[in-house]
Interface confidence: low
């Protein structure tokens, strides 16, 4: 799709002028290349009428100019003294006429409306309400009041005071007669349609003494706001439709062929499958305004979006709307990272979250996207030391590796952890990214005992078995707390016997706690990493109890509970409830998580650009 954008339709009347603004991505090449305005011929081809290089066709001599605004990526074509001969199909574009970097514009010049004297002009946005005021004299106070619309040569009755309503206006029009002190009646038309535009006549009385008033109604289609966002980034559509539709269902739709507008999301619970996991419709204000956030932008997300209000939750004639034209910039500053991360039950994932490196001091967040209630994303963890209670001991947000990336580690995985997660910051909202965690068949790579009990004052040794595939990785033990996982000294005990068909490169690395105290109770993780890039982890909970018998405890896989699997995790103290509590911090300035925080794109290893961008959580 061409990145050039302008008005699809321009309407004017003879003798008037028009200004047509065409937008282009303001790259250095585009800023300096030729800009043109040409008229499309019946057999194809496009005849240049004016260009930025100084050419002006004889048809436009003395009545047109083209001005480039390179700083903001626009150029403007002004055409004066319009005639009906100027009606037709045009292109505004960059470079060579035939190259395709252009936008089609339809110019319609109609005969002057020849407005009658004393015509009141009403200019109202599509979907809104107009009140046409009709004065009358005392002698007509008791007589029939009516409003007609001029259709061709004939006035057609729209509404009258005897109760008639034209079928085209059913359910959206009323006639109000003011108190006798005010000699005025009003016709109120709601949910204005483009077809409502035209000339109206209101009348009090039916004889030669009737009072008449002419009105010209112009219904404006909203010009789309232009939005350029980066591939893999996010966009927020703020929709302010006014308090009169505060209690009407809201929607965001994307225009497809013709006038069709496919619902992307609405407040009635509908959501397009292509946006699963990456969209939030934020709670609306009392004034009826709301916003929609889409993350993980794809090329195919580009297009025309409309937000509106209608009881059906979708675009209907007369819906008040706002419009945007979204372009997705493929030369993205947001790094490519996996959109899917895979882990096994009982295992772990490490997700790498990009953020704007200029904002290293920003607070980092990770949240779990939920489809209910039009989509929401309750926080699970942040970089300030807060972890949701149900995730204690198995979730950590690390500032490493830094310089534009932070890491989130989630272990003790169960099938309930499958879903979409967002990485956010309180800084640049365009850097929200999203990742899907999938739970697949398999065994965790790291093997640790289940529940471990240490005795006060004694020594505890906890083993962690690393398979040979991790031979080149750094192995570590750490003690989990809300702010991360503090590294502890560990001891390489030589080859592990826990893996079948594996050579001497399998390792057993033990955590030793000397003279155990109450403070040693808690979650311990063993894991692998390469520098500041983290791989798999396994968690062990160490309980501390009073001495019963002398000696140290050396815990082995055989003596302790089995390595955690989903059944273990679903019982006892390790049960993980995935009930998300809405966190008020999510709805700060722009009312939704997605508005003030970034989102995450995946786990850590490199991605084959030709792949489906999936990343395994079990093998790095």
């Amino acid at each position: 799709k061409s990145p050039i954008f302008g008005p699809e339709e321009v309407n004017s009347v003879e003798g008037n002028s028009v200004s047509i603004t065409c937008y282009y991505p303001p790259t250095s090449v585009n800023r300096h290349t030729r800009k043109y305005w040409c008229r499309q011929g019946a057999r194809g081809g496009c005849i240049t009428l004016i260009s930025s290089e100084g050419y002006v066709s004889s048809k436009y001599a003395g009545r047109a100019n083209l001005t480039n605004f390179p700083e903001n990526g626009t150029f403007v074509v002004n055409i004066a003294q319009l005639s009906q001969d100027d009606s037709g199909r045009y292109k505004c574009g960059l470079g060579i006429n035939s190259r395709g970097l252009s936008f089609d514009v339809s110019l319609e010049v109609s005969q002057g409306p020849g407005l009658l004297n004393d015509t009141k002009v009403y200019t109202v946005d599509l979907g809104r309400t107009v009140t046409i005021n009709c004065p009358f004299k005392t002698e007509n106070a008791q007589k029939r009041k009516s409003l007609y619309k001029q259709i061709g040569l004939y006035p057609v009755l729209v509404i009258d005071s005897s109760g008639y309503v034209n079928p085209n206006y059913t359910g959206r029009i009323r006639l109000d007669i003011q108190g006798t002190g005010q000699l005025l009646f009003s016709v109120v038309i709601n949910q204005l349609r483009l077809s409502d535009a035209g000339q109206y006549l209101c009348q009090a009385g039916d004889d030669s003494n009737s009072n008449k008033k002419n009105a010209d109604l112009q219904v404006l289609k909203p010009e789309p706001e232009l939005v350029y966002e980066d591939l893999r980034g996010s966009v927020t559509f703020h929709c302010a439709l006014g308090p009169e539709v505060a209690n009407v269902a809201k929607f965001l739709c994307r225009q497809s062929s013709g006038e069709n507008c496919d619902v992307v999301v609405n407040t009635l619970g509908k959501r397009a499958p292509a946006f699963e996991g990456r969209i939030l419709l934020n709670p609306q204000d009392k004034d009826g305004s709301f916003s929609v956030v889409i993350t993980g932008l794809r090329k195919e997300d580009a297009g025309r979006y409309l937000c509106g209000a209608h009881s059906d939750g979708q675009l209907q004639e007369g819906s008040p709307i706002q419009a945007w034209q979204l372009f997705v910039n493929e030369e993205s500053t947001i790094p490519r990272s996996p959109t899917v991360v895979k882990g096994v039950a009982g295992g772990s994932v490490a997700v790498l979250c990009p953020y704007n490196r200029k904002e290293s001091k920003s607070i980092k967040y990770w949240c779990l996207w939920e489809g209910a209630q039009n989509g929401r994303c309750p926080l699970l963890v942040d970089s300030e030391g807060w972890v949701k209670a149900q995730y204690e001991g198995r979730l950590s947000l690390l500032e490493e590796p830094g310089n534009g990336t932070f890491t989130v580690i989630l272990n003790q995985l169960t099938s309930r952890d499958a879903g979409f997660y967002w990485c956010l910051t309180n800084g640049d909202t365009l850097w929200r990214t999203t990742v899907e965690i999938k739970i697949i068949e398999g065994e965790p790579n790291l093997k640790v005992p289940g529940n471990v009990t240490a005795v006060l004052g004694e020594t505890l040794k906890v083993p962690c078995h690393f398979p040979c595939k991790f031979s080149s990785y750094e192995k570590y033990w750490c003690k989990w707390n809300n702010t991360g996982c503090q590294a502890l000294p560990s001891q390489d005990e030589g080859p592990s016997k826990a893996f079948v068909n594996c050579d001497e490169n399998s390792r057993l690395v033990s955590l030793t706690l000397n003279l155990v105290t109450r403070a040693d109770e808690g979650w311990y993780w063993c894991g692998v990493k390469q520098g500041h890039f983290y791989g798999e982890t396994a968690a062990v909970y160490v309980a501390v109890e009073e001495r019963k018998a002398a000696g140290s405890r050396d815990v082995s896989l055989a003596k302790a509970d089995a390595a955690p699997d989903e059944k273990v995790l679903d019982s006892g103290f390790r049960e993980i409830e995935n009930k998300a509590i809405q966190d008020p911090r999510l709805f700060a300035e722009e009312k939704a998580v997605a508005d003030t925080r970034d989102q995450a794109d995946g786990s850590r290893a490199s991605v084959d650009s030709g792949s489906s961008e999936e990343q395994g959580g079990s093998s790095r």
């Epitope: 603004t21 903001n72 909203p222």
Partner: nanobody, 116 residues
Framework: EVQVVESGGGLVQAGGSLRLSCAAS????????MGWFRQAPGKERSFVAA????????GYGDSVKGRFTISRDNAKNTLYLQMNSLKPEDTAVYYC?????????WGQGTQVTVSS
């Protein structure tokens, strides 16, 4: 009646700061992108900064990036331009515009003079 009125201009020394305001009335402020433009003596009017109707995105001319900040208060129907680290070449009449890229509503301008 549509009105776009700039204020806050004046004389300031190089390196100093000024904050321009633009009060809008007579149209639905929240429906339009807003912008600041400037015109130095003997030069064409040039783009300074623009902000989307919601305030969620903004753009700046190359010569002011990092020094000027555009913002808006939709509750007050007011547009602002915070100008820091002013240079003599910033001397110009500054214009506020509603829907500037669609030949929208323009103010009369406010003079900013930066002395060295």
């Amino acid at each position: 009646e549509v009105q776009v009125v700039e204020s806050g201009g004046g004389l300031v020394q190089a390196g100093g700061s000024l904050r321009l305001s633009c009060a809008a009335s007579g149209f639905t402020f929240t429906r339009y992108a807003m912008g600041w433009f400037r015109q130095a003596p003997g030069k064409e009017r040039s783009f300074v900064a623009a902000i989307s109707w919601s305030g969620s995105s903004a753009g700046y001319g190359d010569s002011v990036k990092g020094r000027f900040t555009i913002s808006r208060d939709n509750a007050k129907n007011t547009l602002y331009l915070q100008m820091n680290s002013l240079k003599p070449e910033d001397t110009a009449v500054y214009y506020c515009a509603a829907d500037p890229f669609n030949q929208g509503y323009w103010g009369q301008g406010t003079q900013v003079t930066v002395s060295s």
